[in-house]
């Protein structure tokens, strides 16, 4: 977990697709009866943008409290300020909550850089915008935190929806989902639309902003184009994945894939970047450089650090290359490639320059934890986080930001060989010697 | 080592086209290293950064005058121009043209200077 | 847009003393921030870069502190080379634009 990339810490394109298509979604998806891709109280239920998160309406107790809760797909806990703080417009009380059960236990989760500390209990939660269904889910009360909640971002707590084996403070606590899924016939599957800007928003416009959707239990065909392609997830911890080549303007960087999910790689809403193990972002950045050679831009720009601006609506996206990231698919060696664009790994910045500039940082980053498919990523796409069948769809986002020139892809099957080589075993800790 | 050397009439009337030259002498103004610029400085005032350009041809303008400033690359002669159209008085000021470089960054080595005065 | 606000507008002291001047960013910089010095009639000259490096050939009586919002240029002990103009610069948004108005050290 970095500080400035990983939420809540703030803080390329080869040839043409075989003849031969991947197994994807048509109907086939777990929906509830009656209910056949259209979710329409639940479109456009995310607000936010890419640099501070998305979050969505939540009440927690009775009566209900409702809070702005971050969507974190890179996480497992359901986590709530419930205490003052100067960034919190409001914070859960739990004193006020008829329904509220205390746990009488603890839970400390430290970050590289701050950490939040809470104690757990449950309670009664709902998503307004969401399945009209009422849950009872364990609930971390933030009693004090660091560097966890941002000034401005408007959420007031974060959602886990990654698996019980990285909730804190063991896999025994129940994430929220697990409880949703449980608790109702919600089926086993949510899916997200995260909808950037691609301009900057000042704060009035992102209170009035659509930031996007999440769908729970089901897919919202209104909510892509194309075909859904889909992924096999390697490990049900986070939502892990396996990449199988990079391409920058289709020029494969010709690594050791092993090396592109070293240690791993997972699809985290909570994450703003691209970010990528460290050979694997110095290949990448030198590919984007070179592509990108007509204009020179400072070291500190490609850190992600400096911004850098051109006159309202001139940006040269043109100079600046699509990158490709090849999937595992679903059969025996085939894979499917997604596309970003320069939109998306371009982050518009607010508030720097003159309203006559746009301004961006670069979204891509250096990674020590392995590969992770932020919110630069999803932007591009609609992903279907499909738990019950163990497997992430990918289809282009109809809220993409592109341009007239090119437009964010997923397209397959590719002819990959030895897929499962590229998955990387992290070393199991033999806790026997620990007792020593 | 490496020097710039400012160049133009010293006096322009209103309304009319401000033209000036950077002679890079000592090094390649085609050198990937760097970014060249104008910067301006109106008599007993501060500072202020007119605009940038690579020997590609890439230019970046300050928003404030943007409307008015063309900057331009002759990398056979080793030279930048700068071009400001529409001058009044309040473009009287000594106008240096300088390196960016550190990095980009960083406005690391200048020319003298040339004072240009608008009047009638 | 970033103002870089710089004080005190003036400075007098004697030589060998020690001189410090502030420059204040309106929002965060990072340590994209250099220190400029100019004399009368010359060109400014670049002193400090990245809020702490000293330029090629700037003597170590010059040193530069600071990062975000606030940064300082200090100088050691005052040389009477050193009386003139001095200007910050940030780069945090590029190309580099903004300068602050400048402290002039004068002799007191």
């Known amino acids: 977990t970095q500080h400035g990339i990983r939420l809540p810490l703030r803080s390329g394109l080869g040839g043409a697709p075989l003849g031969l298509r991947l197994p994807r979604e048509t109907d086939e998806e777990p929906e509830e009866p009656g209910r056949r891709g259209s979710f329409v109280e639940m479109v456009d239920n995310l607000r936010g943008k890419s640099g501070q998160g998305y979050y969505v309406e939540m009440t927690v107790g009775s009566p209900p409290q409702t809070l702005n809760i971050l969507v974190d797909t890179g996480s497992s806990n359901f986590a709530v300020g419930a205490a003052p703080h100067p960034f919190l417009h409001r914070y859960y009380q739990r004193q006020l909550s008829s329904t509220y059960r205390d746990l009488r236990k603890g839970v400390y989760v430290p970050y590289t850089q701050g950490k939040w500390e809470g104690e757990l209990g449950t309670d009664l939660v709902s998503i307004p915008h969401g399945p009209n269904v009422t849950v009872r889910a364990n609930i971390a009360a933030i009693t004090e935190s660091d560097k966890f909640f941002i000034n401005g971002s408007n959420w007031e707590g974060i959602l886990g929806l990654a698996y019980a084996e990285i909730a804190r403070p063991d896999d025994s606590l129940e994430p929220f989902f697990d409880s949703l899924v449980k608790q109702t016939h919600v089926p086993n599957l949510f899916s997200l639309q995260l909808c950037g800007a691609g301009f900057p928003l000042n704060q009035s416009e992102v209170l009035a902003s659509v930031g996007g959707s999440m769908i729970i239990g089901g897919i919202d065909h209104s909510l892509y184009t194309g075909s859904l392609w889909y992924t096999p997830i390697r490990r049900e911890w986070y939502y892990e994945v396996i990449i199988v080549r990079v391409e920058i303007n289709g020029q494969d960087l010709k690594m050791d894939c092993k090396e592109y999910n070293y240690d791993k790689s997972i699809v985290d809403s909570g994450t703003t970047n691209l970010r990528l193990p460290k050979k694997v972002f110095e290949a990448a950045v030198k590919s984007i450089k070179a592509a990108s050679s007509t204009e020179k831009f400072p070291d500190g720009f490609w850190l992600g650090e400096q911004l850098v601006c051109w006159q309202a609506g001139t940006t040269p996206w043109n100079i600046f290359p699509v990158i490709s990231l090849y999937l595992m698919g679903e059969v025996t060696n085939q894979s499917f490639r997604i596309t970003i664009l320069p939109q998306q790994y371009l982050r518009p910045v607010e508030d720097v320059a003159t309203s006559q500039d746009d301004c961006y940082k670069f979204a891509i980053s250096q990674s020590s934890t392995g590969t992770v498919m932020g919110a630069v990523i999803m932007e591009g796409f609609y992903v279907v986080f499909d738990r019950a069948r163990k497997r992430i769809g990918f289809a282009v986002s109809a809220c993409h930001v592109h341009d007239e020139f090119r437009t964010a892809a997923v397209e397959g099957p590719f002819v990959t060989l030895d897929m499962e080589d590229c998955g990387y075993n992290i070393p199991q800790t033999d806790e026997s010697t620990l007792m020593t | 080592q490496l020097q710039l050397q400012e160049s133009g009439p010293g006096l322009v009337k209103p309304s009319e086209t401000l033209s000036l030259t950077c002679t890079v002498s000592?090094?390649?103004?085609?050198?990937?290293?760097?970014?060249w610029g104008w910067i301006r400085q109106p008599p007993g005032k501060g500072l202020e950064w007119i605009g940038n350009i690579y020997y590609s041809g890439s230019t970046y303008y300050n928003p404030s005058l943007r409307s008015r400033v063309t900057i331009s690359v002759d990398t056979s002669k080793n030279q930048f121009f700068l071009k400001l159209s529409s001058v009044t008085a309040a473009d009287t000021a000594v106008y240096y043209c300088a390196r960016l470089g550190h990095g980009y960054n960083y406005f690391d080595l200048w020319g003298r200077g040339t004072l240009v005065t608008v009047s009638s | 847009e970033i103002v870089l606000t710089q004080s005190p507008a003036t400075l007098s002291l004697s030589p060998g003393e020690r001189a410090t001047l502030s420059c204040r960013a309106s929002?965060?910089?990072?340590?994209?921030l250099a220190w400029f010095q100019q004399k009368p009639g010359q060109a400014p000259r670049l002193l400090i870069y990245d809020a702490s490096n000293r330029a090629t050939g700037i003597p170590a009586r010059f040193s530069g502190s600071g990062s975000g919002t606030d940064f300082t240029l200090t100088i050691s002990s005052l040389e009477p080379e050193d009386f003139a103009v001095y200007y910050c610069?940030?780069?945090?948004?590029?190309?580099?634009?903004?300068f602050g108005g400048g402290t002039k050290v004068e002799i007191k």
């Open positions: 610069q940030q780069v945090y948004v590029w190309p580099p634009r903004t």
């Open positions: 929002q965060s910089v990072s340590s994209y």
């Open positions: 000592g090094g390649s103004i085609s050198s990937s290293s760097y970014y």
